[in-house]
């Protein structure tokens, strides 16, 4: 079957199923029997989804988080909101812009000496895998006895890309998030139609490596809009 190749960052030049972009939460998805598509999967049910723009933080862009747009509004209606800058109020890390984290309800700078030391309570070599927290408290508990934690290797559970070793990013993998390789030149990449449009991706590819961008492959310009092949190409 194509299961493994469609799930791997290591495979080059495969056409991206469903045009490389998945549907929004609540949209219909389909998959050919036995074939695992980024936008739909015979093993997945989406019964928890509401027909709204996002359900979890990782469905939004890196500078966004998922929340109700109005204070005290309907908890079911969630959209991707702009991240909060330093010194702004927060309830969880994902609300804070990259380079910051949520501490005592305020977004603060995640410099090497504090955030890196906030490792999971058990000092395990795996990290939490979902950006969403429902209790409003920050995800991790400070343990001052161990201030540094080795970076996750490929296949390690992670919380965000900074948990992963160099050359890896933290990407969704079914109900978890794991460290996966940053894409190399010529590898298939996922070009989202807009930021946060990967609501139904059951796995995510990493982004393209330094000096590369995700663009339509030249010989695929004639293809229909829904089947254009995106690969990592030199700027």
């Amino acid at each position: 079957t194509l299961n493994s190749v469609l799930n791997s960052n290591a495979i080059k030049n495969l056409p991206p199923p469903l045009g490389g972009a998945a549907g929004h939460p609540g949209s219909a998805v389909s998959a050919a029997p036995g074939i695992l598509y980024p936008g739909g999967n015979k093993y997945q049910t989406i019964d928890n989804y509401q027909p709204y723009p996002c359900a979890e933080d990782e469905e939004c862009g890196t500078d966004e988080y998922c929340a109700s747009p109005t204070r005290g509004g309907d908890a079911g209606v969630q959209i991707c909101l702009a991240c909060r800058k330093r010194r702004k109020r927060c309830m969880r890390h994902a609300m804070c812009c990259p380079g910051n984290y949520c501490k005592n309800g305020i977004c603060v700078s995640s410099d090497q000496n504090n955030f890196r030391g906030e490792i999971e309570e058990t000092i395990t070599e795996s990290f939490g895998n979902d950006h969403s927290t429902l209790d409003g408290y920050s995800r991790r508990t400070t343990l001052s006895s161990k201030m540094y934690h080795s970076k996750g290797q490929e296949g390690s559970v992670c919380l965000r890309s900074s948990d992963c070793a160099t050359g890896l990013c933290c990407a969704r993998h079914f109900w978890s998030k794991i460290c996966k390789p940053v894409l190399k030149e010529g590898q298939v990449c996922t070009k989202h139609r807009r930021k946060g449009s990967h609501g139904l991706e059951i796995f995510q590819r990493c982004y393209c490596g330094e000096g590369l961008s995700c663009r339509i492959q030249k010989d695929h310009h004639q293809a229909s809009n829904s089947s254009r092949l995106h690969t990592c190409q030199r700027h």
Epitope: T1, N3, I46, E56, E120, S126, S132, G155, P181
Partner: antibody, heavy 115, light 108 residues
Framework: QVQLVESGGGLVQPGGSLRLSCAAS????????MTWVRQAPGKGLEWVSG????????YYADSVKGRFTISRDNSKNTLYLQMNSLRAEDTAVYYC????????WGQGTLVTVSS | DIVLTQSPATLSLSPGERATLSCRAS???????LAWYQQKPGQAPRLLIY???NRATGVPARFSGSGSGTDFTLTISSLEPEDFAVYYC?????????FGQGTKVEIK
Amino acid sequence: QVQLVESGGGLVQPGGSLRLSCAASGFTFNNYGMTWVRQAPGKGLEWVSGISGSGSYTYYADSVKGRFTISRDNSKNTLYLQMNSLRAEDTAVYYCARTIYMDYWGQGTLVTVSS
Amino acid sequence: DIVLTQSPATLSLSPGERATLSCRASQNLFSPYLAWYQQKPGQAPRLLIYGASNRATGVPARFSGSGSGTDFTLTISSLEPEDFAVYYCQQYLTLPLTFGQGTKVEIK
């Protein structure tokens, strides 16, 4: 320390229902995807279902799809497996475990489906 | 589905000996999304290795994992009495998640 404690197993007739619970402690529960795995007597391990930290993503093995429902209550730090239309072949010890590779496991709860 | 075949089915060794357990996947995993577990009678499994070669927390250094593609190996450099158990491999590249049938390491 991380602890997972399953409950709710027992003897049920074919076609019957059971709801398993898994009480979690010692870690920030809603950060973690959770997994159910089962083991028939004297047999190997079989993946049953998985759910993301917020509960928005759920996945099932073909053998249980449409009969079993995985869910979680993050306010109670509890994972559930609702099992309907049970069959003799569902007889097994059911384990809850943390993450997609199972870094912590509960002690298991035995489900026996027999008439 | 990816089928994982473990060999040998049973390994009879003495304490202090080296144990080499094999796990072969029916298709290339391409990525090191493979874990190893130890299970003793009447107990839940215990994670030993994830990401093909990363030791889990609290696992002794005598356990090591290696391999890529379709062939993976768990090595126990010098068997201790508590290491006699059943060992399972598991892939988490694709769904359904699948386990090998297990290798029993028994005292010779």
